[in-house]
């Protein structure tokens, strides 16, 4: 079954159009914007989600120090080109023929250029650092309880195997979640850390991508964990290539 059989919706992606036109009258769901058929038993790729978001009506929308190669998504939203599997194409261009190279989570990793720019391969983001600040609480959360609940959240809500949650760091009020997933570690059927991080990012912003499932309700020993701000750092298997001009 590619989607919920009875009412033909996609539990893992509300930005889809579903109809019973699959093989044998099965429910099949296609992502808005691209029309690509999606597997509703798992997360939809970030590329297809961004494309769907751009096609939607505009009103619908011990701590680690990141190393010098860590990327932050400062460019914001764009309408990406996705390959047939829903992954980002290595080279992205806008309507004015400005092009740039991206990593596997769609974040720019080179200076912008023209149509002659070459991006030889899609470089994998193998380490994601999610930096959160939680709202003030009467007392700090117990670190091991917080660790356990965040691992469970990523496992149960985003279907990310806990082996990819490398660590949870906590110094009140800052929480850091480290996700690691090398190309060699990712087996068929494994959720990509980039997709899990994107779903989590949208969840904490109150913009859940899930259909019919409640919003994120994260509790540690019954105490609500409410996120004030999120910053996500992306580390690629090959360091990014920016000119010195950008670094100054």
């Amino acid at each position: 079954h590619t989607a919920a059989q009875d009412n033909c919706t996609c539990p893992t992606n509300k930005m889809t159009v579903c109809s019973p036109d699959g093989p044998g009258g099965r429910c099949q769901c296609r992502a808005l914007g691209s029309g690509v058929a999606v597997d509703c038993s798992t997360l939809t790729s970030k590329c297809l989600l961004l494309k769907a978001r751009m096609s939607a009506p505009k009103n619908a929308r011990t701590l680690v120090r990141p190393n010098e190669h860590a990327l932050v998504d400062n460019d914001g939203l764009y309408d990406p080109d996705c390959d047939p599997e829903g992954r980002f194409k290595a080279r992205q261009c806008n309507q004015t023929s400005v092009c740039w190279c991206v990593n596997s989570v769609g974040v720019r990793r080179t200076d912008k250029g023209d149509l002659s720019l070459r991006c030889d391969e899609l470089v994998r983001t193998h380490h994601i650092l999610i930096d959160l600040r939680h709202r003030p609480t009467a007392s700090a959360f117990n670190h091991s309880d917080l660790d356990a609940e965040l691992r469970r959240l990523f496992r149960e809500r985003y279907r990310l195997h806990p082996k990819f949650v490398a660590a949870v760091h906590y110094e009140q009020p800052t929480i850091q979640i480290e996700l690691r997933q090398n190309t060699s570690q990712k087996a068929a059927g494994d959720v990509d850390i980039g997709d899990a991080a994107y779903y989590f990012e949208r969840d904490v912003k109150g913009e859940s991508l899930f259909q019919g499932r409640g919003g994120l309700d994260l509790r540690v020993r019954g105490e609500p964990l409410q996120v004030e701000r999120t910053l996500i750092y992306y580390l690629d298997e090959i360091p990014p290539k920016f000119s010195m001009k950008r670094l100054t």
Epitope: H1, P11, S41, S144, D147, A148, E149, R151, R152, R155, E156, R159, L160, H161, P162, K163, V165, G189, V191, G212, R213
Partner: antibody
């Protein structure tokens, strides 16, 4: 690949007991080990679980406080039980998940019997 | 996430068909398993993800369902199918009392 429980015994009410689950033929890391019990003639009851690599533990609501799961070596997981009563008389199984993000249990031990009686 | 399994017991002749139902108190998104247990043995995984057969399990065993309602159907019953069958929600281990249904005893006449 196999799991085997040990430590089952006849104990007095109020006593404590520790059961051991030994894994053979596979690396415990990257798996969760779950403890499940079954009272004589009754159904299966989930007690709790541990994700080995991270050490995170989770318990059924009724088991919190009286049961504790821990990894004691690279091949063993224990279940510590305190303040035992006759209602805890059961066969205790340890089981392994299938290595995915779900909790499908595709490998079980044969079980060990715990009898609580005076 | 309580799991309610019906019937508690069912009896059918060899060659017959048995259907067991399992209802979750909330949507478990097809994250459901079925186990077979024979006396003196641990449970054996038959079906996962509501409808996927575990390796080595005969195709006479068929799982269906979504949302909160799931079924296990055993067709062409054999004497060896006499056992107790349990459903298990494999969606969450947070804030629950039990992840298993109460079980269904299948008697093959």
């Amino acid at each position: 690949q196999s799991l085997e429980e040990s430590g089952g015994d006849l104990v007095q009410p109020g006593a404590s007991l520790t059961l051991t689950c030994k894994a053979s033929g596979f690396d415990l890391n990257n798996y969760s080990i779950l403890w499940v019990r079954q009272a004589p003639g009754k159904g299966l009851e989930w007690i709790g679980s541990i994700y080995i690599s991270g050490g995170s533990t989770y318990y059924a609501n009724w088991a919190k406080g009286r049961f504790a799961i821990s990894k004691t070596s690279s091949t063993t997981v224990t279940l510590q039980m305190t303040s035992l009563t006759a209602a805890d008389t059961a066969t205790y199984f340890c089981a392994r998940d299938d290595g995915t993000a779900s909790y499908y249990l595709n490998l079980w031990g044969p079980g060990t019997l715990v009898t609580v009686s005076s | 996430y309580d799991m309610t399994q019906t019937p508690a017991s069912v009896s059918e002749p060899v060659g017959g068909t048995v259907t067991i139902k399992c209802q979750a108190s909330e949507d478990i998104y097809k994250l459901l398993a079925w186990y077979q247990q024979k006396p003196g043995q641990p449970p054996k995984l038959l079906i996962y993800a509501a409808s996927d057969l575990e390796s080595g399990v005969p195709s006479r065993f068929k799982g269906r369902g979504s949302g909160t309602d799931y079924t296990l159907t055993i067709s062409d019953l054999e004497a060896a199918d006499a056992a107790t069958y349990y459903c298990q929600q494999a969606y969450t281990i947070g804030n629950i009392d039990n992840s298993f249904g109460g079980g269904t005893e299948v008697v093959v006449k």
